[in-house]
Interface confidence: medium
């Protein structure tokens, strides 16, 4: 499955549900359907309180049974390892794919962990992380922040991804803001053309 690079903030904002959870074993194929499901143990919900309503947790994560249809394959055998899972809600069930933002929680930078818990939500529906995959690229709106990690770092895992969020500076302007102790520092040339 070929997946477009995604900034963690985009993954957070575009998902119905973001949770921390542990995978409890091998997938269970659901006969005659397109899906299989992993048993999971949710440890914390980071987004989706409104959508979920009274549900206290999710026992399963559903994914296409065929890898060819972007089914997620969980490779870790460690049941105590906690993962960040950003997925979709479908008829009350959590759905994930090979393209879902799904990473071990300890692999996230401290700034990303903090942002998933409290910061990214401030940019949802207001600001847009705009990927710059080839030069020249240019911002289409003041509500966009130019994401240049792929060009500057050759990877989607770069400085902006690890340490910055695209947040409203004022009602008409979004800028990269540092996810350190202070939320006032901006990335230089954040609004410039790359």
């Amino acid at each position: 499955c070929s997946c477009a690079p995604t900034h963690p903030q985009t993954a957070f904002c575009n998902s119905d549900l973001v949770i921390r959870a542990k995978f409890m074993g091998s997938p269970e194929i659901i006969e005659t359907t397109l899906y299989q499901r992993y048993e999971i143990k949710m440890t914390k919900m980071l987004k989706g309180f409104d959508a979920v309503g009274n549900a206290t947790g999710f026992r399963f994560a559903y994914t296409p049974a065929m890898e060819s249809l972007c089914g997620y394959v969980h490779k870790s055998q460690n049941r105590s390892e906690e993962f960040l899972i950003a997925g979709r809600l479908r008829n009350g069930n959590l759905h994930i794919t090979a393209c879902s933002f799904l990473v071990p929680w300890h692999n996230l930078s401290p700034a990303q962990q903090k942002a998933f818990v409290k910061t990214y939500s401030a940019g949802c529906g207001v600001c847009t992380v705009f990927p710059c995959s080839a030069i020249p690229c240019k911002l289409e709106s003041d509500s966009h922040c130019l994401w240049t990690d792929q060009i500057l770092m050759g990877s989607e895992k770069g400085y902006q991804s690890d340490h910055f969020a695209c947040l409203p500076r004022n009602p008409d302007l979004c800028t990269w803001q540092y996810l350190g102790v202070s939320m006032t520092r901006s990335l230089p040339l954040a609004k410039a053309e790359a």
């Epitope: 070929s2 477009a4 005659t32 359907t33 060819s68 249809l69 972007c70 759905h95 393209c99």
Partner: antibody
Framework: QVQLVESGGGLVQPGGSLRLSCAAS????????MSWVRQAPGKGLEWVSA????????YYADSVKGRFTISRDNSKNTLYLQMNSLRAEDTAVYYC?????????????WGQGTLVTVSS | DIVLTQPPSVSGAPGQRVTISCSGS????????VSWYQQLPGTAPKLLIY???QRPSGVPDRFSGSKSGTSASLAITGLQSEDEADYYC?????????FGGGTKLTVL
Amino acid sequence: QVQLVESGGGLVQPGGSLRLSCAASGFTFSSYAMSWVRQAPGKGLEWVSAISGSGGSTYYADSVKGRFTISRDNSKNTLYLQMNSLRAEDTAVYYCARLDTYYPDLFDYWGQGTLVTVSS
Amino acid sequence: DIVLTQPPSVSGAPGQRVTISCSGSSSNIGSNYVSWYQQLPGTAPKLLIYDNNQRPSGVPDRFSGSKSGTSASLAITGLQSEDEADYYCQSYDQRKWVFGGGTKLTVL
């Protein structure tokens, strides 16, 4: 916005061949499984074939298995359907459709279709 | 072959409520989601309902879907002349995507 544009339809004799194309734009083509669905004149929709995002896996309806081949060129954002040993009952409008990446049991976007007529 | 069964036609007067049924089996509707597509005359099909009862953005709430066991249905309330179209149900059945034969809705 998502756009799917089919081409390559036309009149062909029974036993002949035809290749349909579907040019895709407005989304990351290689991330989506794609499909062909056809509709005979005055009839209903019939699923024909599907292909994974990478092109490594293909699926066919029994009615076309062994005669039709689905393929894709992700560098050109194009889906293809090679139709061989055509029969009169293959006469239909052929639609290119995108399978939703999270829920690949449904078709979320469709092209306008291209007409294939098999007749002598 | 047509795997899902729909009535060939239904009709109703403007403002009325009509329902279109879709009958399948345990291997398709019984264990999978149902989608509905609207095909206006001379145009391509358009996704109308997915996940049995969910509407994509832009689809009026006059359209609603439901599923029970191995059957599904589409309901249209406050019928309007622009609803005159063909409607198809669709599901999944063991590595195959399956459609109903279609129902022509006539607004009287």
